[in-house]
């Protein structure tokens, strides 16, 4: 799997999970989240060469098509596969509220 | 939706469905499929600017992150959303066999 265990240990130009820390205030302009101040969002990036972690029949076909037609622009792309939620604390006036924001953290990637 | 109805009617540089006909023999080197000779596989391509058809909370966050941090390389990517199967006819010796290949045709796209 193209997850932290694999990607953060290996120098990988191909599609892989990349570390990205997002500071809510500085990077998003969000002042409304009290805790955490930021989080490890991560992101997916890198080349998708022939059959590198292709996730669907279509992406495998596209991968093969690109190998045979190297001038083609139709190539798979490195995107998130598994995502996890992030629990945040924010205030509605003086009242604290805990909320789980879905699909905020990328855990693994794929070529799609 | 970034589907044929929208994308094939509009000239769109941003993430959209693109037409792609794949000839099994010529483009994939597959001689084993008897019918059809090829099919409209389509593919997804184009830029994913600020919140253009972002499909998850993470891709929306990443989109906002890129707006505030334009030097960042962490940007969403244009990939397939809805896929459909393709029915093919092939032969096992002299015996015809009909098979449904899943996720072969891209029907719509998203920024992920």
């Amino acid at each position: 799997a193209l997850d932290a265990a694999y990607c953060f240990r290996n120098v990988q130009d191909n599609c892989c999970l990349r570390p990205l820390y997002i500071d809510f205030k500085r990077d998003l302009g969000w002042k409304w989240i009290h805790e955490p101040k930021g989080y490890n969002a991560n992101f997916c990036a890198g080349a998708c060469p022939y059959l590198w972690s292709s996730d669907t029949q279509h992406s495998r076909v596209l991968s093969l098509y690109n190998t045979i037609n190297p001038e083609a622009s139709a190539s798979p792309c490195c995107v998130s596969q598994d995502l996890e939620p992030l629990t945040i604390l924010y205030y509605i006036g003086k009242t604290p509220k805990i909320e789980q924001l879905s699909n905020m953290i990328v855990k693994s990637c794929k070529c799609s | 939706a970034l589907d044929a109805a929208y994308c094939f009617r509009n000239v769109q540089d941003n993430c959209c469905l693109r037409p792609l006909y794949i000839d099994f023999k010529r483009d994939l080197g597959w001689k084993w499929i008897h019918e059809p000779k090829g099919y409209n596989a389509n593919f997804c391509a184009g830029a994913c600017p600020y919140l253009w058809s972002s499909d998850t909370q993470h891709s929306r966050v990443l989109s906002l992150y890129n707006t505030i941090n334009p030097e960042a390389s962490a940007s969403p990517c244009c990939v397939s959303q809805d896929l459909e199967p393709l029915t093919i006819l092939y032969y096992i010796g002299k015996t015809p066999k009909i098979e449904q290949l899943s996720n072969m045709i891209v029907k719509s796209c998203k920024c992920s």
Epitope: G29, W32, Y90, Y91, I92, G93, K94, T95, E99 | L64
Partner: antibody
């Protein structure tokens, strides 16, 4: 320069529907919580609803809950207020406003307002 | 919900006079969950004071705010002709956000 421009106000019969639009410019729209506030003719200000961009967390005043829906198109820098089952007491000038940063906060920028009249 | 009671409902003062408007909350807001707005006829409200005492950018120094808990006040140190408007207090300590009923300020 920060600008908020509302539109969509009209004369509508009781029980009818209307959608208000607020287009924002001059700042990173998705960074600030957005509110709708209304003002009946010759009366004071009444808060209606808020939405947190990107995460789409919304909250409503009891008087409009179940009838009004606040929504946002982050890519178009646009805030909406879908108003259904309108009552005569919904007659007011509707303002969109941006908070300083917190969910409940002072509102540092307001639109010019759009007038909704509910009458038979 | 928190009820905000503003007084007086209206006042008429001479130019250069000091203006004081008070706002009382039905329950404690703490020290910083109060804002003051100015609304001129046919215009949207304009933020003057937030956090009970902080002036919004571009607001003249003659406008000030103070108070905490349930009692807050808004002051114009020297009334100018352009200050003719309705002034509102707003609490944001609790949901729903509520406003005072407004104070109409006129010049004699």
């Amino acid at each position: 320069d920060v600008q908020l421009v509302e539109s969509g106000g009209d004369l509508v019969k009781p029980g009818g529907s209307l959608r208000l639009t607020c287009v924002a410019s001059g700042y990173t729209f998705s960074s600030n919580v957005m509110h709708w506030v209304r003002q009946a003719p010759g009366k004071g200000l009444q808060w209606v609803a808020y939405v947190i961009p990107i995460v789409d967390i919304a909250y409503y005043a009891d008087s409009v809950k179940g009838r009004f829906t606040i929504s946002i198109d982050n890519s178009k820098n646009t805030l909406y207020l879908q108003m259904n089952s309108l009552k005569t007491e919904d007659t007011a000038t509707y303002y969109c406003a941006r908070t300083l940063g917190l969910v409940l906060d002072a509102m540092d920028y307001w639109g010019q307002g759009t007038l909704v009249t509910v009458s038979s | 919900e928190i009820v905000m009671t503003q007084s007086p409902a209206s006042l008429s003062l001479s130019q250069e006079e000091k203006v004081t408007i008070t706002c009382r909350a039905s329950q404690s807001l703490g020290s910083s969950y109060l804002a003051w707005y100015q609304q001129k006829p046919g215009q949207a409200p304009k933020l003057l004071i937030y956090g009970a005492s902080s002036r919004a950018p571009g607001v003249p120094s003659r406008f000030s705010g103070s108070g905490s808990g349930t009692d807050f006040s808004f002051t114009i140190s020297s009334l100018e002709p352009e200050d003719v408007a309705v002034y509102y207090c707003q609490q944001y300590a609790d949901s729903p956000i509520t406003f005072g009923q407004g104070t109409k300020l006129e010049i004699k």
